[in-house]
């Protein structure tokens, strides 16, 4: 069966610093979502081969990819509190399957110390709420992305 | 190919419901946003929505909030689109649009149904 | 009323340019990409320009989309008699949380 391998289980990062999220698959996909769990899941990003990836506005001009959607590192730029939470992928096939998903921690500097991962995974049951809206930074830099993507930083 | 095939033309009368439906083929259905925009006759095209097929989400133009419901059954690729309350102003053609881009939600079209004409009258 | 505002008509002779104008805000041409759609008559729209200034392939070149503060245009060059059809701008509102569309143009080759 089709299984997602989505590292790290948990990371604690300062305010503005960037976090890796790379998920793993055995191939067969149609493509693959990055998701924010929560009581209301938001889908962060759309990635496809040969497809311009979508992202989540909250993310303009944020986040990179690199790798294939069979081997997908997503890199967010510019952690703000607001993006503390719970981001699982998602691989589209005929069944979806889900990865065990990534606690990302964004803490203010001086509080680093009390606020750290445990080396379990996250659990499902257990998932801080989908951030309220927060600042974009205009995305009009402006021309398009190569089709194929480039694995650089959205405008 | 990319095909979005809507469901045909329908007569109602004020105050009842319409449901038109949008099948879309030749991609990943739940990886692109569906759009609903209507078009009444003789005027400019309308905004009323979008589903994000994927999990189901949706946002609706205020105009059409309460009134508006959109639907999706993956297991067919298919978007529906519900209109309660129906007024003869309603009396438009409604398109599905399959939305890319560089951002979710964004107004960027590259496949449009064939159209389905709704119209309300007694 | 459209969020959007552009002329309801434009004209010009076959081998002309004609320019049509897209006038927003800074809550959505101001900070956001602009899409230009070709609507002929009796069928579904068809997209035209997207990022702004992007030509999808199988646009002739002919057709070019700029974008300049709030505001947005699209120039149609060498005017020819199947350009004859409505032109739609639009964007996506930060305010609205929501696409926008222009009323429409109505291009009319003399």
């Known amino acids: 069966a089709q299984e997602v391998q989505q590292s790290p289980h948990c990371t604690t990062v300062p305010v503005g610093a960037s976090v890796n999220i790379t998920c793993s698959t055995s191939g067969g996909l149609r493509g693959i979502y990055l998701r924010q769990l929560g009581p209301q899941p938001q889908d962060i990003i759309y990635y496809e081969d040969g497809v311009v990836p979508t992202t989540d506005r909250r993310f303009r001009g944020r986040i990179d990819f690199s790798g294939s959607q069979d081997n997908l590192t997503i890199t967010m730029h510019r952690l703000q509190l607001s993006d503390t939470g719970t981001y699982t992928c998602q691989a589209i096939t005929e069944v979806n399957v889900y990865g065990s998903g990534t606690l990302v921690l964004v803490t203010e500097e001086q509080s680093q110390g009390w606020h750290r991962c445990s080396d379990a995974p996250p659990r499902a049951s257990a998932l801080p709420a989908p951030p309220t809206g927060s600042a974009l930074p205009d995305p009009q830099t402006a021309s398009a992305l190569p089709d194929p993507p480039a694995a650089s930083a959205l405008p | 190919e990319v095909q979005l095939v809507e469901s045909g033309a329908e007569v109602k009368k004020p105050g009842a419901s319409v449901k038109v439906s949008c099948k879309a083929s030749?991609?990943?259905?739940?990886?692109?946003?569906m759009h609903w925009v209507r078009q009444a006759p003789g005027q400019g095209l309308e905004w009323m929505g979008w589903?994000?097929?994927?999990?189901?989400?949706?946002n609706y133009a205020q105009k059409f909030q309460g009134r508006v419901t959109m639907t999706r059954d993956t297991s067919i690729s298919t978007a529906y689109m519900e209109l309660s309350r129906l007024r003869s102003d309603d009396t438009a053609v409604y398109y599905c649009?399959?939305?890319?881009?560089?951002?979710?939600?964004?107004?960027?079209?590259?496949?449009w149904g064939q159209g389905t004409l709704v119209t309300v009258s007694s | 009323q459209s969020v959007l505002t552009q002329p309801p008509s434009a004209s010009g002779a076959p081998g002309e340019r004609v320019t049509i104008s897209c006038s927003g805000s800074?809550?959505?041409?101001?900070?956001?990409?602009v899409y230009w759609y070709q609507q002929l008559p009796g069928t579904a729209p068809k997209l035209l320009i997207y990022?702004?200034?992007q030509r999808p392939s199988g646009v002739p070149d002919r057709f070019s989309g700029s974008k300049s503060g709030a505001s947005a245009s699209l120039a149609i060059s060498g005017l020819r008699s199947e350009d004859e059809a409505d032109y739609y701008c639009?964007?996506?509102?930060?305010?609205?949380?929501?696409?926008?569309f222009g009323g429409g143009t109505k291009v009319t080759v003399l």
């Open positions: 639009a964007a996506w509102d930060d305010s609205l949380s929501g696409p926008v």
């Open positions: 800074s809550s959505n041409i101001g900070s956001n990409y």
């Open positions: 589903i994000n097929p994927n999990s189901g989400g949706t």
């Open positions: 030749g991609y990943t259905f739940t990886g692109y946003y």
């Open positions: 990022n702004s200034n």
């Open positions: 649009a399959r939305g890319v881009g560089l951002w979710f939600g964004e107004p960027y079209f590259d496949y």
